[in-house]
């Protein structure tokens, strides 16, 4: 878990990028809630389940997907940055590097098809944003929001995912459990 500073967003719904399908065999790099029966790799991820949950009836193993978005590149990240030291500058150009997980490809909710398009209008009560913020927080976390839709990868990737994650569809958030196939047909736009 190391790195050079904390993060600037959560996840975004978008199309699969070039090179991603080939890398979906690495899908297991995505987070999983591990217990003793998971593979060594899953155990190494070490994402804990709160002990209080079992006593209250929640599922023990619910995978936490890592939505890997290559499109947001930091222009100036230094090792001196920390979790809470302000907002970075974003490069909105699409990166072609294929990476495990769901990557931005055919222009999703963060990378707009028209650079001059206005950001989505949201109510101030649910989402406040200072002007001129390049990477809108709501766009960045769109994959974690209710109603998020996940694009449909190639068939082998779907099979691979279904083998890894057997729990039922996750309404809206697509955070734990299988990426719902019913949600994998459309891009998520704002």
């Amino acid at each position: 878990m190391g790195g050079n500073s904390m993060a600037s967003g959560v996840g975004v719904g978008a199309g699969l990028g070039a090179g991603v399908n080939q890398r979906m065999d690495s899908y297991a790099h995505m987070n999983g809630w591990s217990n003793g029966s998971y593979s060594m790799m899953q155990d190494q991820l070490g994402y804990p389940q709160h002990p209080g949950l079992n006593a209250h009836g929640a599922a023990q193993m619910q995978p936490m997907h890592r939505y890997d978005v290559s499109a947001l590149q930091y222009n100036s990240m230094t090792s001196s940055q920390t979790y809470m030291n302000g907002s970075p500058t974003y490069s909105m150009s699409y990166s072609q590097q294929g990476t495990p997980g769901m990557a931005l490809g055919s222009m999703g909710s963060v990378v707009k098809s028209e650079a001059s398009s206005s950001p989505p209008v949201v109510t101030s009560s649910s989402h406040s944003r200072a002007p001129c913020q390049a990477g809108d927080l709501r766009d960045m976390i769109s994959m974690y929001l209710p109603g998020a839709e996940v694009p449909e990868p190639a068939a082998p990737s779907r099979l691979h995912m279904s083998q890894h994650y057997q729990s039922g569809p996750v309404p809206g958030t697509a955070i734990n459990g299988t990426l719902p196939l019913s949600h994998m047909h459309h891009h998520h736009h704002h």
């Epitope: 190391g2 790195g3 967003g9 302000g86 907002s87 913020q133």
Partner: nanobody
Framework: EVQLVESGGGLVQPGGSLRLSCAAS?????????MGWFRQAPGKERELVAA????????YYADSVKGRFTISADNSKNTAYLQMNSLKPEDTAVYYC???????????WGQGTLVTVSS
């Protein structure tokens, strides 16, 4: 190794308040300036409750907590907070903080803190 540690959970009566804290420790950090609070109620899916970028210039709240919860961050302490007011029984859940933006996902997760709203 980055560690996120939540605190502030507990038992509270309906209508009461709690303030959750999420402290980041353990050396260097990834990415920049986003923290999220998730919750998972018994038998339900995990949901994003609130998120903040920077020290508050960009925030998000789930509809279910609008006007009741406030997310904030203290840059100097590498800590995020979730102020929860007018708590309801349906707010009962394990609350997790998340961070570690790395190429599109939250990478670092706390262990969770249990919030129980009951009379």
């Amino acid at each position: 190794e980055v560690q996120l540690v939540e605190s502030g959970g507990g038992l509270v009566q309906p209508g009461g308040s709690l303030r959750l804290s999420c402290a980041a420790s353990g050396g260097g950090f990834r990415g920049n300036a986003v923290m999220g609070w998730f919750r998972q109620a018994p038998g339900k899916e995990r949901e994003l409750v609130a998120a903040i970028r920077g020290s508050g210039e960009d925030t998000y709240y789930a509809d279910s907590v609008k006007g009741r919860f406030t997310i904030s961050a203290d840059n100097s302490k590498n800590t995020a907070y979730l102020q929860m007011n007018s708590l309801k029984p349906e707010d009962t859940a394990v609350y997790y903080c998340a961070g570690g933006w790395r190429r599109g996902y939250f990478q670092d997760w706390g262990q969770g803190t249990l919030v129980t709203v009951s009379s």
